[in-house]
């Protein structure tokens, strides 16, 4: 009894291909020994047709191969363009043909089904619609029209003009009889099922004068389109199911090991939690087509995906589908970047976003993923400078460090900033990436006054305290605008009293505005960076007001220098100003964000390339 196993019989039709898999015990010797496929002749000898050592016989040239899979103890013989001459007795085996381990296989190649003369062949994908045309003569115009399905030797009535409908076709079939003068009736079958395939017979009239026409309906499962994408990258499934289902709920599902299909996302609001933060179903066009984008691809995202339409938002037999086989390439061109960035309330994060380095001129964007319904990702900032109004003064997109990476800085963090954000460009869509911002317990590392009111014409000095761990970092002040943050001259003023534990290294860096002008009003950022890699930032809003006569209340220039934990405003300040302290963004009110250009002097940092050390800016 041979331990080699395979199919004892294989039956196919002319022109087809076969893929014969032979199993062997995967011992070390077996894995590496010769594998062969041979044909048994009348003499009992077995003539090799193809072997694992590269041999292919002349009558198999260009149409057969043998592939060994030693890790799972199988080898596969593929034979294409079968002819009836290929029928016969074969062996698949290991070692030498005449002795060794082998298994007998009988291959039978038949002519294929003989179709009656004049048969019209309809080839349609599952779930789609077919229209079968049935001609008839004038004398049969008033008579009964019918469509039958041939099953073996019998014919089963499918539909007729007397309103009969076979239950298997209920609600998805109709027979159309045209007006006078047109000698053809049609049968339309919607939402085709695999079980609908076969030979049909149209009939008009009865008796010897009846008209008959044969139709061969071939219903195909869609061949999956092979999709290869990079780990950490993005894939887009474009799904066009036809106008017939334009108003029906759509879905994308993934085929599981039980061969059922788990919904990944649908238009009814369902979404698989494994894709939280990294999937969008784009609204459908008038023709019913839609697309699904998945970012942050993981190895476990590999598999067979189906998109489809059904009122339940999930796979049902007989409804149109499209299929993809997704492969995720682990040797990715997309660099590793943190998928989670942590920040503290009141603090900041600096997010590194990869893009295709060949597309340095592309527009860069950052959007906030929203999970409601099909998901959406409204843009918050873009490299041309537009910033969503509620992010004024606390969000900036920088081209640095360049060469395939840009930076997004978000400060004045609150718990509402926690969530998923996408980095994208108007170029290569496969480089879309997702990052999750988490807000954790802790204090911001940089300390600045809560807000500052400067007096026109006077000098303003704004301190920024930083701890010793940033002593080797470059410190900067910049004036925020919706096109970026313009670096300003600042001075390092030596030790800070805000961090008592590391006095000699704990310092403050100050910004001086002298004299204060109207143009100085706005947001200022204090930050640290290493080369072109940005660390934490802290923001201050500077309001500018006229010099008041004695007795009126305003923030004195000196008060701006107060230590971070001191109140900047005195106790009698109006309620609205208290609110403004808690949320400096209220100072900005409902202004349209305009490009404030190169105010207060200084120049923007140049774009350079370097490599990232760390991401984000949480306090430890």
């Amino acid at each position: 009894k041979s331990p080699v196993f395979g199919p004892q019989e294989v039956s196919s039709v002319e022109g087809n291909s076969v893929s014969i898999k032979c199993y062997y015990p995967p011992t070390s010797v077996n894995r590496h020994t010769r594998k062969y496929w041979c044909r048994k002749g009348a003499s009992g000898r077995c003539i090799t047709l193809v072997s694992s050592e590269g041999y292919v016989s002349s009558n198999y040239a260009g149409r057969a191969n043998l592939t060994n899979f030693p890790e799972n103890g199988t080898f596969v013989v593929n034979i294409a363009q079968l002819s009836r001459d290929d029928s016969g007795h074969y062996k698949c085996g290991l070692g030498i043909n005449s002795r060794g381990l082998s298994f007998d296989v009988s291959l039978e190649v038949s002519q294929g089904p003989e179709l009656p003369n004049g048969t019209e062949v309809y080839t349609v994908d599952v779930g789609r619609t077919v229209t079968i045309k049935c001609p008839f003569k004038t004398e049969n115009a008033p008579k009964t029209k019918a469509l039958y399905k041939k099953i073996g030797q019998t014919s089963v009535l499918v539909i007729d003009s007397r309103n009969y409908v076979n239950p298997n076709y209920k609600d998805r079939i109709r027979l159309r009889i045209p007006g006078t003068g047109q000698l053809i009736f049609t049968v339309v079958i919607d939402r085709l099922r695999l079980s609908d395939h076969g030979l049909y017979l149209c009939q008009a009239g009865d008796g010897s004068n009846r008209d008959e026409k044969n139709a061969d309906l071939q219903v195909l499962e869609p061949e999956p389109e092979l999709v290869y994408e990079d780990l950490r990258g993005s894939v887009t499934f474009h799904c066009a199911l036809g106008l017939e289902v334009a108003n029906v709920a759509k879905f994308l599902c993934r085929v599981n090991s039980r061969e059922t299909c788990d919904v990944v996302i649908n238009t009814l609001g369902k979404r698989d939690s494994a894709f939280e933060g990294r999937i969008l179903l784009n609204p459908q066009d008038k023709d019913g087509s839609f697309s699904v984008v998945i970012t942050g691809l993981r190895k476990e995202d590999e598999g067979r995906y189906l998109c489809g339409a059904h009122s339940d938002g999930q796979l049902q037999e007989g409804w149109p589908i499209q299929a993809w086989q997704l492969f995720v390439n682990e040797e990715s061109t997309i660099p590793r970047s943190p998928t989670v960035v942590k920040g503290v309330a009141g603090g900041s994060v600096a997010v590194l976003c990869p893009y295709n380095p060949k597309e340095s001129q592309s527009l860069k964007y950052w959007c906030l993923w929203e999970g409601a319904q099909n998901g959406r990702c409204p843009l918050l900032v873009e490299s041309q400078g537009l910033v969503q109004e509620q992010y004024e003064g606390r969000l900036s997109l920088l081209q640095e460090p360049g060469n395939g990476t840009f930076t997004v800085i978000l400060n004045q963090l609150t718990t509402q900033d926690a969530g998923f954000y996408w980095c994208l460009t108007n170029g290569d869509t496969r480089w879309r990436t997702t990052v999750e911002i988490k807000i954790i317990e802790g204090e911001p590392n940089l300390k600045v006054p809560g807000n500052v009111t400067a007096v026109l014409g006077e000098t303003l000095n704004i301190p920024c305290h930083f701890p010793c761990k940033f002593s080797s970092y470059e410190k900067y002040w910049c004036k925020w605008s919706n096109t970026g943050c313009q670096t300003l001259p600042s001075q390092d003023e030596g030790p800070s009293e805000a961090f008592v534990n590391c006095d000699e290294n704990s310092r403050l860096v100050s910004l001086t505005l002298n004299p204060v002008t109207r143009a100085d009003e706005g947001w200022y950022w204090c930050g640290v960076k290493q080369g072109h890699f940005y660390g934490e930032t802290a923001a201050v809003y500077v309001a500018v007001e006229e010099k008041k006569v004695a007795g009126s209340r305003y923030v004195s220039p000196a008060k701006a220098d107060a230590a971070p934990d001191e109140k900047v405003l005195d106790s009698g300040v109006r309620e609205i100003e208290n609110k403004a302290i808690q949320d400096p963004r209220l100072f900005a009110e409902e202004k349209v964000v305009a490009d404030t250009g190169d105010q207060a002097g200084g120049s923007r940092a140049s774009v350079d390339s370097s490599s990232s050390e760390e991401q984000g800016g949480s306090s430890k």
Epitope: V18, S19, G112, R193, L194, R258, E317
Partner: nanobody, 128 residues
Framework: QVQLVESGGGSVQTGGSLRLSCTAS????????MGWFRQAPGKEREFVAG??????????YYADAVKGRFTIPRDNADNTIYLQMDSMKPDDTAVYYC???????????????????WGPGTQVTVSS
């Protein structure tokens, strides 16, 4: 979801014949694998015979113990496969199960774990 139902089981004398059928309802597939397994009292479930269909090609597999006696006939109708059992022996007494999976010729048909769907089984008894 796919449901499988076996029928045709019963009692037979040594040397006799039986024909089991397995009907699948629910989803149908153009590419699938179906198998017959059996489990005798106190023994493990074992592979008997199997069929894999990929387009217009069909592969037939048989266990050594039944080779030459059991066949899966070519007249399988849509969604139904048969197991023709001839020259039966007392050793063939068991509960016979039908199993199915979608997919092509890419798994070992002898392995029970390769199948997603199972029927409830039908008893076959061979007496001497």
């Amino acid at each position: 979801q796919v449901q499988l139902v076996e029928s045709g089981g019963g009692s037979v004398q040594t040397g006799g014949s039986l024909r089991l059928s397995c009907t699948a309802s629910g989803r149908t597939f153009s590419n699938y694998g179906m198998g017959w397994f059996r489990q005798a009292p106190g023994k493990e479930r074992e592979f008997v015979a199997g069929i894999t269909r990929s387009g217009r090609t069909t592969y037939y597999y048989y266990a050594d113990a039944v080779k030459g006696r059991f066949t899966i006939p070519r007249d399988n109708a849509d969604n139904t496969i048969y197991l023709q059992m001839d020259s039966m022996k007392p050793d063939d007494t068991a509960v016979y199960y039908c199993a199915a999976r979608q997919g092509e010729n890419n798994y070992d048909p002898r392995s029970g774990s390769a199948y997603n769907y199972w029927g409830p089984g039908t008893q076959v008894t061979v007496s001497s």
